[in-house]
Amino acid sequence: CDLPQTHSLGSRRTLMLLAQMRRISLFSCLKDRHDFGFPQEEFGNQFQKAETIPVLHEMIQQIFNLFSTKDSSAAWDETLLDKFYTELYQQLNDLEACVIQGVGVTETPLMKEDSILAVRKYFQRITLYLKEKKYSPCAWEVVRAEIMRSFSLSTNLQESLRSKE
């Protein structure tokens, strides 16, 4: 399955929207930074495309879930959020089309399940952090910057998968 060029452009647009969503500078929140333990190894180059697509799908689905809560709606600009949802939704569709075509279904299911679980736990840590920080502006900025960082890492993986073919 070849992810369309529009998927790559969508990833870049998503990063741009994440950047535009910033309301305060992380510099004002140095003490609020937190190591969420992004499972970078689950996005490592050792995977074949078949193994990465479900993990990437899970990553984007979890980002969607995180930013579509009531607390998120209160924290961010509504217009930017709507555009953000649209981009994420399109990427989910692109990835689902690949899964439907059979890519990522048959090979090493256990490895994928472990990877998907690692991504879910990562987002659970982020959700818990936000709760503990009472969804403060600094907490949301830390999370926005972390998602931007982890999303750009997973986007780099998508690009490397494309270039390997």
């Epitope: 990063l15 950047a19 535009q20 910033r22 305060i24 500078s25 992380l26 510099f27 004002s28 140095l30 003490k31 930074r33 190591d35 910057a145 972390e146 931007m148 960082r149 750009s152």
Partner: antibody, heavy 122, light 107 residues
Framework: EVQLLESGGGLVQPGGSLRLSCAAS????????MHWVRQAPGKGLEWVSA???????YYADSVKGRFTISRDDSKNTLYLQMNSLKTEDTAVYYC????????????????WGQGTLVTVSS | DIQMTQSPSSLSASVGDRVTITCRAS??????LNWYQQRPGKAPKLLIY???RLQTGVPSRFSGSGSGTDFTLTISSLQPEDFATYYC?????????FGQGTKLEIK
């Protein structure tokens, strides 16, 4: 391309004043904290001052009360007003920021200007 | 203020050598530690952030490690362009502070 370009350096007498400017381009200037870092001739790097995106200001003890950092987001420009200059303020002054996604999160200073030389001498 | 202490202050090595520079913080800074390279007459360049993450475009022969108070920068196989001065810097709290630098010279 992300760029920072300093200007305003020069020779000034002890007790004098100087205003440095830094013109930014290639990124959303208003969203980022900006810093001044200096380097005396043949010496190491010293963080001088910073201003947050919201305008909060921070200073090293060595310049507190003498230097004032400010920004004009409409002009994409950072300033450093230096008063009561001392000979020990002689240095190359760099305008710096953290812009890349990873560097921003960890506040690694990934964008530097070319520097402007300030010489305080009688 | 957090003090950053680098060692050695200068180091002579040859092309192809493996080189390690250390940096110690006066208090726990977790992994908020960055490494810079500065060539004569040039602005510093970010090599590594978050103690071990390679900045985009930096060759993989550079690596960083450590957390808490003790950190290292390693160059696995020195290249001619690596002879420069290296600085560590903490970004845990304001004021940001730098190590005094390590000058890497050709033997």
């Amino acid at each position: 391309e992300v760029q920072l370009l300093e200007s305003g350096g020069g020779l000034v007498q002890p007790g004098g004043s100087l205003r440095l400017s830094c013109a930014a381009s290639g990124f959303t200037f208003s969203s980022y904290a900006m810093h001044w870092v200096r380097q005396a001739p043949g010496k190491g790097l010293e963080w001088v001052s910073a201003i947050g995106a919201g305008g909060g200001t921070y200073y090293a003890d060595s310049v507190k009360g003498r230097f004032t950092i400010s920004r004009d987001d409409s002009k994409n420009t950072l300033y450093l007003q230096m008063n009561s200059l001392k000979t020990e303020d002689t240095a190359v002054y760099y305008c710096v920021s953290s812009v890349g996604a990873g560097a921003y999160y960890y506040q690694g200073l990934d964008v530097w200007g070319q520097g402007t030389l300030v010489t305080v001498s009688s | 203020d957090i003090q950053m202490t680098q060692s050695p202050s200068s180091l002579s090595a040859s092309v192809g050598d493996r080189v390690t520079i250390t940096c110690r913080a006066s208090q726990d800074i977790f992994t908020y530690l960055n490494w810079y390279q500065q060539r004569p007459g040039k602005a510093p360049k970010l090599l590594i952030y978050d103690a071990s993450r390679l900045q985009t475009g930096v060759p993989s022969r550079f690596s960083g490690s450590g957390s808490g108070t003790d950190f290292t920068l390693t160059i696995s196989s020195l290249q001619p362009e690596d002879f420069a001065t290296y600085y560590c810097q903490q970004s845990y709290s304001i004021p940001y502070t730098f190590g005094q630098g390590t000058k890497l010279e050709i033997k």
